[in-house]
């Protein structure tokens, strides 16, 4: 039977080395066996490159394409093929579809005067455009109480957050995770980082009296 695309490719770039496209077929498909995504930078002399997609679900395919350090002017021509049949054709400008890399190495340290210091790493090297453009969202949640959670927006440069222990329940186990976005690129949010967990052993002041 004929091969058809149900939801056409949606692509995002980490704006440093990789662009990822995902699409849905109209029936379960062995993506790597049946499909190929060709991509070519619209630039004089650029060669055509081929991405072999993988299955994310039965009918969902995903392709990760290595790209050079992206710049604003880059535009890629994309063609989705099933053998000799062209299923879809479109263009993709990485700078207009940025999904930042996930922040890394989230850690929690006890700090002076009953505060917790949350630290993580900026996922971009200093020379990359996005390094100084990222802002973060930190989600802190009580592992045993789904209603006890807080969201912090970190809009200053440093990848850190100071958290007063008194704002959390004493003796409770908390988990934190962080994600990033780049406002000037109108990006989507990055994926959440892996969670890190700690015990909030702050003793309320009243108990000292």
């Amino acid at each position: 039977g004929s091969v058809k695309v149900l939801h056409e490719p949606s692509c995002f770039s980490d704006y440093i080395s990789t662009s990822v496209c995902q699409w849905k077929m109209d029936h379960p498909t062995n993506c790597s066996a049946e499909l190929r995504l060709s991509y070519q930078l619209d630039f004089m002399g650029s060669e055509n490159h081929t991405c072999v997609p993988e299955n994310r679900e039965d009918s969902v395919c995903v392709c990760s394409m290595p790209i050079d350090d992206a710049v604003e002017a880059d535009v890629y021509q994309l063609d989705l093929w099933a053998g000799q049949q062209l299923l879809w054709s479109g263009s993709f400008q990485p700078s207009k579809h940025v999904k930042p890399r996930t922040p890394g190495n989230l850690t929690v340290h006890p700090n002076i005067s009953h505060t917790w210091l949350l630290m993580w790493t900026n996922p971009y090297p200093t020379e990359n455009h996005l390094h100084s453009e990222l802002t973060y969202m930190v989600n802190v949640s009580n592992d045993n109480d789904p209603e006890d959670f807080k969201v912090y927006n970190v809009t200053y440069m440093g990848p850190t957050l100071r958290l007063a222990a008194s704002t959390l329940k004493s003796g409770a186990s908390y988990s934190a995770r962080v994600r990033a976005w780049a406002q000037t690129y109108n990006s989507t949010w990055s994926d959440w980082s892996p969670s890190t967990t700690w015990l909030n052993y702050y003793e309320p002041w009243e108990q000292h009296l």
């Epitope: 930078l41 002399g45 650029s46 060669e47």
Partner: antibody
């Protein structure tokens, strides 16, 4: 030493055909785009055509489109320019030159960093 | 097509002086920060052209530092300091950004 040696230039009548060759040595030929540039007697430089490293992409000046064909044989480290339906205004010295590195996603550009010695094509009855 | 315009078309300079050649493009040659696709070439009498400057300001291998390129977008300049007799020839600018590649008309440099 990086070197380009052109050959194939000749005297040919209008409407005739000619094939120029350019043999490359001293660099990874298949990784670089190659370009032909010509120079009419006493005139300036005019770009003719470019071919990517794999040969998959070709570009032509409007003046030669449909008449000239650029190609390459990476196994022989040789660039070609097939010239058909030649006209008097095609009379020129034809140079081959090494252009951008095209094995990367975005070609790396160094200008036309090596040129051949040129081969003269004369179109006259 | 991108039109390249060079000025002056001829230039006469005494040895040891500085020569400047201007090149203007009809469209911006800036692809991204620091990447202006503008080259300078020298064709000495009876010889093939040779590359001097690429990407606006980067010297080609073996080119003396007396040759320098500057400019961005649409306006570029080639400067040759401490001019020598050996610098005689025709200087061309060329845009390498998009097809068709286009050259300036050339500037003939004569040493007095």
């Amino acid at each position: 030493e990086v070197q380009l040696v052109e050959s194939g230039g000749d005297l040919v009548k209008p409407g005739g055909s000619l094939r120029l060759s350019c043999v490359a040595s001293g660099f990874p030929f298949r990784d670089f785009a190659m370009t032909w540039v010509r120079q009419a007697p006493g005139k300036g430089l005019q770009w003719v055509s470019l071919i990517s490293g794999s040969g998959g992409k070709t570009y032509y000046a409007d003046a030669v489109k449909g008449r000239f064909t650029i190609s390459r044989d990476n196994a022989k480290n040789t660039l070609y320019l097939q010239m058909n339906s030649l006209r008097a205004e095609d009379t020129a010295v034809y140079y081959c030159a090494v252009d951008r590195l095209t094995k990367t996603i975005r070609p790396q550009y160094y200008g036309l960093w090596v040129w051949g010695q040129g081969t003269l094509v004369t179109v006259s009855s | 097509d991108i039109v390249m315009t060079q000025t002056p078309l001829s230039l006469s300079v005494s040895p040891g002086e500085t020569a400047s050649i201007s090149c203007r493009s009809s469209q911006s040659l800036l692809y991204s920060i620091g990447y202006n696709y503008l080259d300078w070439y020298l064709q000495k009498p009876g010889q093939s052209p040779q590359g001097l400057i690429y990407l606006g300001s980067k010297r080609a291998s073996g080119v003396p530092d007396r040759f320098s390129g500057s400019g961005s977008g649409t306006d570029f300049t080639l400067r040759i300091s401490r001019v020598e007799a050996n610098d005689t020839g025709v200087y061309y600018c060329m845009q390498g950004l998009q097809s068709p590649l286009t050259f300036g008309q050339g500037t003939k440099l004569e040493i007095k």
